[in-house]
């Protein structure tokens, strides 16, 4: 999946159903959601809160998806539900927890399958903070690469986040990937839900730092779809 830069976290081609025609540059999109860890979702926490009504996945937290609470329930009544872990049944990518995606009806680990696709942010989006890109956590980092490769500083070429120093992730910048800062509390983040109609995210942001999740700002709940703002917030 090195359609990207050198350090070691490139953007990969999205499977045709999500990313468009295979073979076209447009089929390669931004990176995977959240911090991807080989063993699952290391920083995932479960908040105790009232069910939040929603119309689409983007209105829910990183570890949630929007659906009817009962199977075959009224489609008009939807709430944010906890994401589904690895090996659980799914119908779409958004149902699976960060670090996983829906393949053949089952949530499988992006970590093992190198799925790093997102089509969330359009190329015209321009919020204030440095347009970091997100790339999945370095998966399958070999012993040799750990031993022999110095970690890249901000701006360094990378293929995966393990190529970057602590506090940085490997994220897309235009058509290659570079090390960018992991997002801090209050910084604008990108909700990584896949919506095929959106443009390529050529300025990926990193994921939110430890203890933070990318959630819609409270005062933006009533805003129109186009102006929803997500920021890194404490769990």
């Amino acid at each position: 999946t090195l359609n990207s830069v050198l350090n070691s976290n490139a953007i990969k081609n999205l499977p045709p159903p999500l990313g468009g025609a295979a073979g076209h540059p447009g089929s390669a999109v931004s990176a995977a959601p959240g911090i991807l860890y080989p063993g699952g979702n290391k920083y995932q926490t479960i908040d105790n809160y009232q069910p939040y009504p929603c119309a689409e996945d983007e209105e829910c937290g990183t570890d949630e998806y929007c659906a009817s609470p009962t199977r075959g329930g009224d489609a008009g009544v939807q709430i944010c539900l906890a994401c589904r872990k690895r090996r659980k049944r799914c119908m779409r990518h958004a149902m699976c927890c960060p670090g996983n995606y829906c393949k053949n009806g089952i949530c499988v680990s992006s970590d093992q399958n190198h799925f790093r696709g997102e089509i969330e942010e359009t190329i015209t989006e321009s919020f204030g903070n440095d347009h970091s890109t997100l790339d999945g956590y370095s998966r399958r980092t070999t012993l040799s690469s750990k031993m022999y490769h110095t970690k890249g500083q901000e701006g360094s070429v990378c293929l995966r986040s393990s190529d970057c120093a602590s506090g940085l992730c490997c994220a897309r910048h235009f058509w290659s990937k570079i090390c960018k800062p992991v997002l801090k509390e209050g910084q604008v983040c990108t909700k990584h839900r896949r919506k095929g109609s959106h443009g390529l995210e050529i300025f990926q942001r990193c994921y939110c730092g430890e203890g933070l999740s990318c959630r819609i700002q409270k005062d933006h709940h009533q805003a129109s779809n186009s102006s929803r703002l997500h920021t890194c917030q404490r769990h």
Partner: antibody, heavy 117, light 107 residues
Framework: EVQLLQSAAEVKRPGESLRISCKTS????????MHWVRQMPGKELEWMGG????????SYNQKFKGHVTISVDKSSSTAYLQWSSLKASDAAMYYC??????????WGQGTLVTVSS | DIVLTQSPASLAVSPGQRATITCITS??????MNWYQQKPGQPPKLLIS???TLRPGVPARFSSSGSGTDFTLTINPVEANDTANYYC?????????FGQGTKLEIK
């Protein structure tokens, strides 16, 4: 049309310095990482390293780190590969190659470097 | 570093026949494999990029398959101007590494 035009062949002696160039056109130079690849006579290709012109960040193959330096001049959309002290074993064909989402899609025509005493 | 073992080192195929080149990686790289063609005196040309994606302008005679550690480049049918060296390149993990190359000759 994307083009990568490399500097002419060089004949050098061991211990001499050298800088070869790769002038690009037809695309926005700062939007793609530039790689350098070595091909010794009759041998396979070896990735030496790359640079992202946006902030000048580099990554090197450990095999070449410390022996070569990769740089760019954004004003002229040119990438450089340089040696401060050449060795006989540096004799090879050197290619610059543009990164496109991980793959090296456009290549320069190559610069042949001969190092002989 | 990820080691790419390419085979055969050389092969000769008659026009109209099928040529198959394999590349085995020392570790799982998902589908982050690229294939290049290099003719004498020329730089490599990208044929197929990650995800077994045929590059624009490359004839459909070229195809690739594989994921994980085993990858195959197939040329079917082979034509006279396919004489060249073919290389695999993994773009999964730094440093990028290439296979040793396969020399394809047309009988």
């Amino acid at each position: 049309e994307v083009q990568l035009l490399q500097s002419a062949a060089e004949v050098k002696r061991p211990g001499e310095s050298l800088r070869i160039s790769c002038k690009t056109s037809g695309y926005s130079f700062t939007e793609n990482t530039m790689h350098w690849v070595r091909q010794m006579p009759g041998k396979e290709l070896e990735w030496m390293g790359g640079i992202n012109p946006h902030k000048g960040g580099t990554s090197y193959n450990q095999k070449f780190k410390g022996h070569v330096t990769i740089s760019v001049d954004k004003s002229s959309s040119t990438a450089y590969l340089q040696w401060s002290s050449l060795k006989a074993s540096d004799a090879a064909m050197y290619y610059c190659a543009r990164d496109w989402l991980g793959a090296m899609d456009y290549w320069g025509q190559g610069t042949l470097v001969t190092v002989s005493s | 570093d990820i080691v790419l073992t390419q085979s055969p080192a050389s092969l000769a195929v008659s026009p109209g026949q099928r040529a198959t080149i394999t590349c085995i990686t020392s570790t799982d790289i998902d589908d982050d494999m690229n294939w290049y063609q290099q003719k004498p005196g020329q730089p490599p040309k990208l044929l197929i990029s990650e995800g077994n994606t045929l590059r624009p302008g490359v004839p459909a005679r070229f195809s690739s398959s594989g994921s994980g550690t085993d990858f195959t480049l197939t040329i079917n049918p082979v034509e006279a101007n396919d004489t060249a060296n073919y290389y695999c390149l993994q773009s999964d993990n730094l440093p990028y590494t290439f296979g040793q190359g396969t020399k394809l000759e047309i009988k």
